[in-house]
Structure formats: structure tokens, C-alpha cells
Interface confidence: low
């Protein structure tokens, strides 16, 4: 509805200036538990694998993710819950902490990219197309704008 | 083949070293049609619009390289190189160097993400059963670094 | 317990090779990224150079770039720190480091290999 | 690159002091910041990462916290084996390192 379409672009503006607050409350809930977690890991090998960080940052990010908020909603927390009465209070916030985040991110498309079509290839083609004879001359003359953006991309696929 | 995958992993290993070479090329035979392009467009928009560096940058990024990639190699570049029969050899030149690129992207997945399938997710989910009980405390104590990874996306995609 | 242990230091002198060995035990080598970290009085300690678990990706500092080649053999769970064209602003104390990825902190050091770039 | 800057360079204090050293960043890095100890000779050891979480075997006299750009190592009661030098190190955007805080005894 357009009701929600409204909400859905208020979230878009608000999210940024909320998310390290976000961040600093998944951490708050956290902290409460981690000690008790932390101690208990006596594994030297790796879950969070950096794959899993180039995935986020890659082009299936939003889909792995929500996978990976529904993987610890679902499955590891509910299991945490259980090994000690004095932390499944804890482990709750923190669960509704991610709720929270997850809710934020599905209100706003823009952090779902996953669910959107890029247009801009599109109307770079139809504004060049309108621009007849001069658009050859515009599109030439902003070559150098291309390969600053191509860099930009590729800057970007090094670092990730 | 195998030949081709070590072809393509070696194209990996190098192309970050090669970017600045290949970008530099491009530059610099850019450089040798630039005046000329730029002193007969004559129009005050931008065809190469901020909208078009958010998709590269975006998870659609690699399908809207290519396909500007193939823009100005079959649209604008065959055009252009009729205006002028000075400019016709700088202009192919130009083609050249891109196609060179676009042959670099081709034979590395890695800046072709969009061809690929990921698979962390899946292979944190697999080590989590492995672990059994162990599991539990490991993804727990691992959450920091979720964190991590949920504000590197979030920043990512505020940034872009 | 984790343990990286550097070889292959030495005094070169400038525009010579020399090939840094870092032998890992005590945990998977396979499952974690590895760096070369740098330290000299002069600039502190410096990031050289990572290589990605399955040696897929390699990264330097731009000073090295070109010149230093990072490697690394699973299977001998060894890493390596190729150095050519050595210059006297090399000289430093070359860590082995691993990590768990590029946004990830740098949990294990080896005791360093000293490196004397002079002629 | 992030540049980072330490205060101070040298403290000198006491066995069961409170000691407070900082770390400033150029630009805002989230928690991404870790702490180690080195002592003479010996390698850098992780004492604190993600700003604050305290590495296995760590005393818990030592803390971290801040974020953003600003970073804080505490040592709740100087004990003689903690006269070392401590460096910050942000992971954010690629590695670098503060130049250290070098802790000695009065």
C-alpha cells in the first residue's frame, strides 16, 4: 500500500544516523553474554570465515545476510537459550536486538538491494540515444569519467 | 580446462599489480582524442551520471560494467571513429585497451561475481552441525565478528 | 598451542633477494589468512603483505609492491616472503602474523627474522 | 590510509597504579581496533580486539573501549610485568599501527 511505501522510504532516510546506535545496542546485548560464551569456546578453528565477509560484501549480500540472521535467530540462539537459565535472558535481547535490525533492513530496499533492478545503464543508453549526433561527442568526451568509475569498481571488488 | 583455470587463477594473482598499468593505458590513450571530443561537446549535462557509479559499485556492479563496457565498444566507439579520419587509429587504440580489460575481468571470477554461486553460508551451517553441541558456543562467541560483518555490509552499502 | 616460526634472514645488500620461510603448527593453516608485518625504529611496525587462506588473493603495501611476492604451501603449512630488489629502507624485523580475514585483527605473531639491507 | 596517533609516547608510573593509554584515529573505524603489549625483544601479543573483548589468557586488569576515532587501554593495577610498549592497530580499512605508548616504572 502507499502507506507503507511511505514507511518504507522514512526508514531509508532515518537508517544511516540509526545504524551505529543499532550496532552499539547488538553489541551492549552482546557483552552481557560473550564472557560466558567465550570461555566456553575452546575450538581454535574458524565459523566466521572471511568468506562469509567477502559474501556480505558481494553481489549475494543481502542474501547471505538475512540467511545469516535467520541461521542465529533460529538455530543457534534458541539452542543457547538453553545451556544456562542465568544468560537466556540475555541471549533474548540479543535476539530481539537482531529482529530489530533485520525489520530495519526489510523496511528499506535500499540495504535489500538484492530485490532491486538497477536502472542506470538504461538511462545512460536512452539519454545518448536522444542526444542523436552529440551524444558521441558526450559520451567520448566523458571517457575519462568511465574509467574513473571503472577504477572505482575495481578499487572496490581489490578491497573486498 | 585445467589450463584454463590456472590461466585464470594466475589472471587473479596479477590483475590487482596490473590495475594501475591497465588504467594508466587507458588514460593515456584517452589523453590522445580527449581535446578533440571535448571541444565539440558542447552540451552542459552529464551523461555519466552519480547513479551509474552507485550500480558499478552495487550488486548489480559487474553486469553494469559490461554492458557500458559494451556500450562504448559497439555504440559509441564505431561512431566516433567516423568523425575524423586523424582521430580514427587514437579511437581504436582506445577500443583496444578496453577490450583488454574486459578480457582481464572475463578470465577472473573474482571481478565477475555476479557469475558465481556463494557458498559461505553454506559452509558455516555445515561446520555448525559438525560441531554439535561445540557449535553453539563457537557461533556465540563468534557473534562479535558478525557484528563486524553486518556493520562492514551496512557501511558498504551506505557508502555506495 | 600456536606457533610461527621465521627463517631466511640476513644482510643483503641493496638491490639483492633474499626469501623469508614462516613455518605454522598448532592450529589448521588452511583456515586462516597470513601476513608479513614489519618493524623498524624508524616507522614502527608496517603491513607488508597478506595472502588468502587458499592463496586465491595477494595484497602489499604499495612500497612493496612489485618487488615482494607473499606465498604459501598448505600442505607444508609454510608461508613465504619472496624480497627482491631490496632496498636500505627495508631493513626491519619481518613478522609472520595470522588473521582471519581483512577486517580482522592480527591474533598471532612469530618472534620475527631481522632483515639488514646495507651495503 | 587511516592514520593513528598515541598520548601519551611515555609514561612512566607505579606498581598498582591505574594507567590509561590512548589512541586517536584519522577517521571513524566502528570498533575495529585492537590492542598488543611488546616487550623488549619479544613479538607484539594481542591483548584486546573489536575495541574492547579481551583475548584468552589476558589479565583481566587490562581493558579497552572507545569508539569511532577515539580508543582507550586501561590497566586497572600496574603490575611489574606490564612495562612494555603498547601499540593500537586498526583493521577498518587495510592495517596500520600507532607508533606506541612506551610504559615504564617510576
Known amino acids: 500500500s502507499p502507506g507503507q511505501g511511505t514507511q518504507s522510504e522514512n526508514s531509508c532516510t532515518r537508517f544511516p544516523g540509526n545504524l551505529p546506535h543499532m550496532l552499539r545496542d547488538l553489541r551492549d546485548a552482546f557483552s552481557r553474554v560473550k564472557t560466558f560464551f567465550q570461555m566456553k569456546d575452546q575450538l581454535d578453528n574458524i565459523l566466521l570465515k572471511e568468506s562469509l565477509l567477502e559474501d556480505f560484501k558481494g553481489y549475494l549480500g543481502c542474501q547471505a545476510l538475512s540467511e545469516m540472521i535467520q541461521f542465529y535467530l533460529e538455530e543457534v540462539m534458541p539452542q543457547a537459550e538453553n545451556h544456562d537459565p542465568d544468560i537466556k535472558e540475555h541471549v533474548n535481547s540479543l535476539g530481539e536486538n537482531l529482529k530489530t535490525l533485520r525489520l530495519r533492513l526489510r523496511r528499506c530496499h535500499r540495504f535489500l538491494p538484492c530485490e532491486n533492478k538497477s536502472k542506470a545503464v538504461e538511462q545512460v543508453k536512452n539519454a545518448f540515444s536522444k542526444l542523436q549526433e552529440k551524444g558521441v561527442y558526450k559520451a567520448m568526451s566523458e571517457f575519462d569519467i568511465f574509467i574513473n568509475y571503472i577504477e572505482a569498481y575495481m578499487t572496490m571488488k581489490i578491497r573486498n | 580446462s585445467p589450463g584454463q583455470g590456472t590461466q585464470s587463477e594466475n589472471s587473479c594473482t596479477r590483475f590487482p599489480g596490473n590495475l594501475p598499468h591497465m588504467l594508466r593505458d587507458l588514460r593515456d590513450a584517452f589523453s590522445r582524442v580527449k581535446t578533440f571530443f571535448q571541444m565539440k561537446d558542447q552540451l552542459d549535462n552529464i551523461l555519466l551520471k552519480e547513479s551509474l557509479l552507485e550500480d558499478f559499485k552495487g550488486y548489480l556492479g559487474c553486469q553494469a560494467l559490461s554492458e557500458m563496457i559494451q556500450f562504448y565498444l559497439e555504440e559509441v566507439m564505431p561512431q566516433a571513429e567516423n568523425h575524423d579520419p586523424d582521430i580514427k587509429e587514437h579511437v581504436n587504440s582506445l577500443g583496444e585497451n578496453l577490450k583488454t580489460l574486459r578480457l582481464r575481468l572475463r578470465r577472473c571470477h573474482r571481478f565477475l561475481p555476479c557469475e558465481n554461486k556463494s557458498k559461505a553460508v553454506e559452509q558455516v551451517k555445515n561446520a555448525f552441525s559438525k560441531l554439535q553441541e561445540k557449535g553453539v558456543y563457537k557461533a556465540m562467541s563468534e557473534f562479535d565478528i558478525f557484528i563486524n560483518y553486518i556493520e562492514a555490509y551496512m557501511t558498504m552499502k551506505i557508502r555506495n | 598451542e600456536v606457533q610461527l616460526v621465521e627463517s631466511g634472514g640476513g644482510l643483503v645488500r641493496p638491490g639483492g633477494s633474499l626469501r623469508l620461510s614462516c613455518t605454522a603448527s598448532g592450529f589448521t593453516f588452511s583456515d586462516y589468512h597470513m601476513a608479513w608485518v614489519r618493524q623498524s625504529p624508524d616507522k614502527g611496525l608496517e603491513w607488508v603483505a597478506s595472502?588468502?587462506?587458499?592463496?586465491?588473493?595477494?595484497y602489499y603495501r604499495d612500497s612493496v609492491r612489485g618487488r615482494f611476492t607473499i606465498s604459501r604451501n598448505n600442505a607444508k603449512t609454510t608461508l613465504y616472503l619472496q624480497m627482491d630488489s631490496l632496498r636500505s629502507e627495508d631493513t626491519a624485523t619481518f613478522y609472520c602474523?595470522?588473521?582471519?580475514?581483512?577486517?580482522?585483527?592480527?591474533?598471532?605473531w612469530g618472534q620475527g627474522v631481522m632483515v639488514t639491507v646495507s651495503s | 590510509d587511516i592514520q593513528m596517533t598515541q598520548s601519551p609516547s611515555l609514561l612512566s608510573a607505579s606498581v598498582g597504579d591505574r594507567v590509561t593509554l590512548n589512541c586517536k584515529t584519522s577517521q571513524n573505524i566502528f570498533e575495529n581496533l585492537a590492542w598488543y603489549q611488546q616487550k623488549l625483544r619479544e613479538p607484539p601479543k594481542l591483548l584486546i580486539f573489536n575495541a574492547s573483548p579481551l583475548q584468552a589468557g589476558i589479565p583481566s586488569r587490562f581493558s579497552g573501549s572507545g569508539s569511532g576515532t577515539d580508543f582507550t587501554l586501561t590497566i586497572t593495577s600496574l603490575q611489574p610485568e606490564d612495562v612494555a610498549t603498547y601499540f593500537c592497530h586498526q583493521y577498518y580499512s587495510g592495517y596500520t599501527f600507532g607508533p606506541g605508548t612506551k610504559l615504564e616504572l617510576k
Open positions: 595472502i588468502t587462506l587458499d592463496a586465491t588473493y595477494t
Open positions: 602474523t595470522r588473521h582471519r580475514g581483512f577486517s580482522v585483527w592480527l591474533d598471532y
